[in-house]
């Protein structure tokens, strides 16, 4: 059962696992969230009935039972992890702390002019965790104004004392702000010699990479693979670091893999979420039930239901044995990886998929693209949705795309004459127009937030959010799309498709089934060469065929522009202009999305 | 010590082509970031490109992407910057640095080792 709410003056009693220190109650339920065993917790504020040494402790806690006595305390708070919820959640915090010093190892010590100054800094160094910085009214002199980067082995901090003038933070890694390099490379035959900081067992070498991003302090590691020489290290994952960050030392070596942390892209990738399934592999760990199941689908949706299940193995059904049901192994570890993996016996194995709204929802793998034809079949585009206006009578105004589960993204130029949100009604999960009938449930719109900077299509900055009424639940027919990381700007995309219910030629109508093509990119230099008499802007992108045919027109304004790569479909682009429609040298020009990351997140995450 | 040497800069047409190229010396250029950056008169330093040697991932500005290319030599510890469709906007002083650690590859604020550069000059 899910409980989001926050128990005041309330301790649970027993259960402890660890203890960690956070500065508030709702970060520390975000850590017991993430750590492999912790159902519970119980925090500590700042009090003058409590011993100063216990402020701000965060005592992460386990119970078969998924609950413990409750024991009343004054300042203690306590709740429970979000693993029992299917909502979404996120390591991004954003939260300055004032008057909080949170201790660590010190490594980096810079002036910076503002305390944003010091979390970028900080978001922007491979080994800062968190930051504390003396304002310029910090009574000593020679430290004002100083940002203090800290790291620790858990990622949070040591300790947490009160002192005045400073403030302190986290790092934005895990919001998709850092501008280091992503490096999704997996290097085949290679042993990265450096200090390891953690081992565990894994089944590849992709699960291996998972694990290193979400572990604070690994930034590359080596993978010794089922065929490695040496028996006791196959299926190794090592968890590595180094002073500069980068691996000292490579060894060629066969049967071994290695690769980096990608902490600083984490938004396009899975990482949480190891979804496959490893066949003739048996995870070995603590045993929590032993189930009948028909298949090992149906073991994983087992594991994924019992909320203390980490990983599972499946045994298929000996001949006609049990009604042809094989027996579902649900287990746990300490550190939510099996402690052993062992091959040839059968087995198939795979983890809980409860993790995996840690991740974006949007890197969920979707339906297969329809190749070939212009209709879209249901599903293929969950993201995208219709834009109605009611006034003066009901009509599709514009497409729009989902990026959170209130908020949709859409261009500026489609509310040219639009007075009010209160006329606006999205429509998610629609394949036809025909299917939206007076009693079809839509979204309504709260707010309407249209670039500053928008003057007309033309000039750049045609984009909007809508914040809608009421929450979207994602479904298979309507989830969100990545958007691009800022670390991704140089990925050059090539498979780019653009949806909408718009016209299929400049004189046409709106089109009852979603139209899908795909398009190409086009450099801005080409682009430009197209329309000499606009400027277009590192804040645009272009898209089209040379000799025309195939391009977004009238109606599909505000819709994606949707690119996939890494296997992870992407919101590269908001249909914007064009001169006609499908004209030759004449590609579609949309908002550039990635320039516009920073706005959309600071919109979309302001209290 | 580490040195970086470029050289390849010259003079070219709006439209030309030039390749730069960066030897280094005091240092194995095979785990590091490599970058390109520019400096035109009056103008802060910005990053053009940059390549983390050890595996040849690379990382452009948006002015530059489809037009330059980023490449590497292990054997020969270069970088090289193939610079095609160079604009008048291209001139620019242009310089080589080297970040022996992880790193925001586009920021020149982050790289500890410079060349002495070598200009640029695209007319039209």
């Known amino acids: 059962e899910c409980v989001t709410q926050l128990l005041k003056d309330t301790c649970f009693e027993g259960g402890d696992i660890t203890t960690v220190f956070t500065p508030s109650a709702k970060y520390c339920q975000v850590v017991c969230t993430y750590h492999p065993r912790c159902l519970l917790f119980t925090f500590t504020a700042e009090s003058p009935s409590e011993d100063p040494t216990r402020w701000f402790t965060c005592v992460l806690k386990d119970s078969v039972t998924e609950t413990l006595p409750r024991v009343n305390r004054t300042a203690a708070i306590s709740g429970y992890s979000f693993k029992q919820c299917s909502h979404q959640i996120s390591a991004c915090n954003k939260d300055i702390y004032v008057d909080l010093d949170m201790k660590g190892i010190n490594y980096n010590s810079s002036v910076a002019k503002s305390a944003q100054e010091c979390q970028e800094r900080c978001t922007d160094d491979v080994h800062c965790h968190f930051f504390t910085y003396a304002t310029r009214q910090f009574p000593s002199l020679e430290h004002r104004n100083i940002c203090l980067l800290k790291h620790t082995q858990t990622g949070t901090p040591t300790r947490i004392t009160k002192l005045d003038k400073v403030v302190s933070g986290f790092s934005l890694k895990s919001c998709a702000l850092s501008n280091l390099a992503c490096i999704r490379d997996i290097f085949p035959n290679t042993v990265f010699a450096d200090s390891n900081i953690d081992s565990v067992m894994a089944p590849d070498a992709f699960v291996c990479g998972r694990i290193c991003t979400h572990h604070p302090g690994c930034l590359f590691f080596t993978f010794f693979s089922q065929e490695w020489p040496k028996e006791s290290q196959r299926n190794l994952c090592l968890l590595k670091t180094s002073e500069s960050g980068l691996p000292s030392t490579r060894i060629k070596k066969s049967k071994a893999l290695s690769g980096f942390s990608l902490q600083s892209c984490r938004h396009s990738i899975p990482v949480f979420c190891h979804s496959s399934f490893y066949h003739d592999t048996d995870f070995l760990g603590e045993e929590l039930d032993i189930v009948a199941a028909k298949s090992h689908e149906a073991c994983q949706k087992l594991c994924t239901n019992a909320v203390r299940c980490q990983f599972f193995t499946y045994t298929p059904a000996q001949a006609s044995c049990n009604e042809g049901k094989g027996k579902c192994y649900l287990k746990l570890s300490s550190n939510g990886s099996p402690t052993k993996i062992l091959h040839g016996r059968g087995g198939i194995s795979g983890y809980t998929l409860r993790l995996c709204k840690m991740d974006n929802e949007c890197t969920t793998k979707i339906k297969p693209r329809i190749v070939g034809g212009t209709a879209s079949v249901r599903g293929e585009w969950p993201w995208q949705v219709t834009l109605h206006t009611t006034s003066p009578t009901q009509r599709h105004l514009c497409g729009g795309s989902i990026i959170g589960n209130q908020w949709i993204l859409t261009a500026a130029h489609c509310f040219y004459g639009v007075e009010s949100p209160k006329i606006l009604r999205v429509y998610s999960g629609i394949l036809n127009q025909s299917e939206i009938k007076e009693d079809t449930s839509f979204f309504g719109v709260q707010e309407i937030i249209i670039h500053d900077q928008y003057k007309m299509a033309e000039s750049g900055y045609d984009i909007a959010l809508l914040k809608l009424e009421t929450t979207v639940n994602y479904t298979d027919s309507q989830r969100p799309i990545c958007l691009p990381s800022k670390g991704d700007r140089n990925v050059i995309y090539t498979d780019c498709w653009v949806t909408g219910w718009g016209y299929r030629k400049l004189r046409d109508k709106i089109q009852n089934t979603l139209q899908k093509a795909k398009i190409p990119l086009v450099t801005n230099e080409e682009c430009q060469k197209r329309y000499r008499g606009h400027k277009i802007t590192h804040k645009m992108i272009c898209a089209g065929y040379r000799e025309g045919g195939k391009d977004a027109c009238k109606g599909d304004s505000g819709g994606p522009l949707s690119c996939k790569h890494n296997e992870v479909w992407h919101l590269v682009g908001i249909t914007s202009w064009g001169e006609g429609c499908a004209q030759r040298e004449r590609p579609g020009v949309y908002t550039n999305v990635v320039e516009y990351v920073d706005w959309i997140l600071e919109k979309t995450q302001a209290v | 010590q580490v040195q970086l040497q470029e050289s390849g800069g010259g003079s070219v047409q709006a439209g030309g082509s030039l390749r730069l190229s960066c030897a280094a010396s005091?240092?194995?250029?095979?785990?590091?970031?490599m970058g390109w950056f520019r400096q035109a008169p009056g103008k802060e330093r910005e990053g053009v490109a940059a390549?983390?040697?050890?595996?040849?991932?690379?990382f452009y500005a948006d002015s530059v992407k489809g037009r330059f290319t980023i490449s590497q030599d292990n054997a020969k510890n270069t970088v090289y910057l193939e610079m095609d469709t160079l604009k008048p906007e291209d001139t620019a002083m242009y310089y080589c640095?080297?970040?022996?650690?992880?790193?925001?590859?586009?920021?020149?604020?982050?790289?500890?080792?410079w060349g002495q550069g070598t200009q640029v000059t695209v007319s039209s």
């Open positions: 390549i983390y040697t050890g595996g040849a991932s690379t």
């Open positions: 005091g240092f194995t250029a095979s785990s590091n970031f």
């Open positions: 640095a080297a970040a022996p650690r992880w790193i925001a590859p586009l920021r020149a604020d982050r790289y500890e080792y």
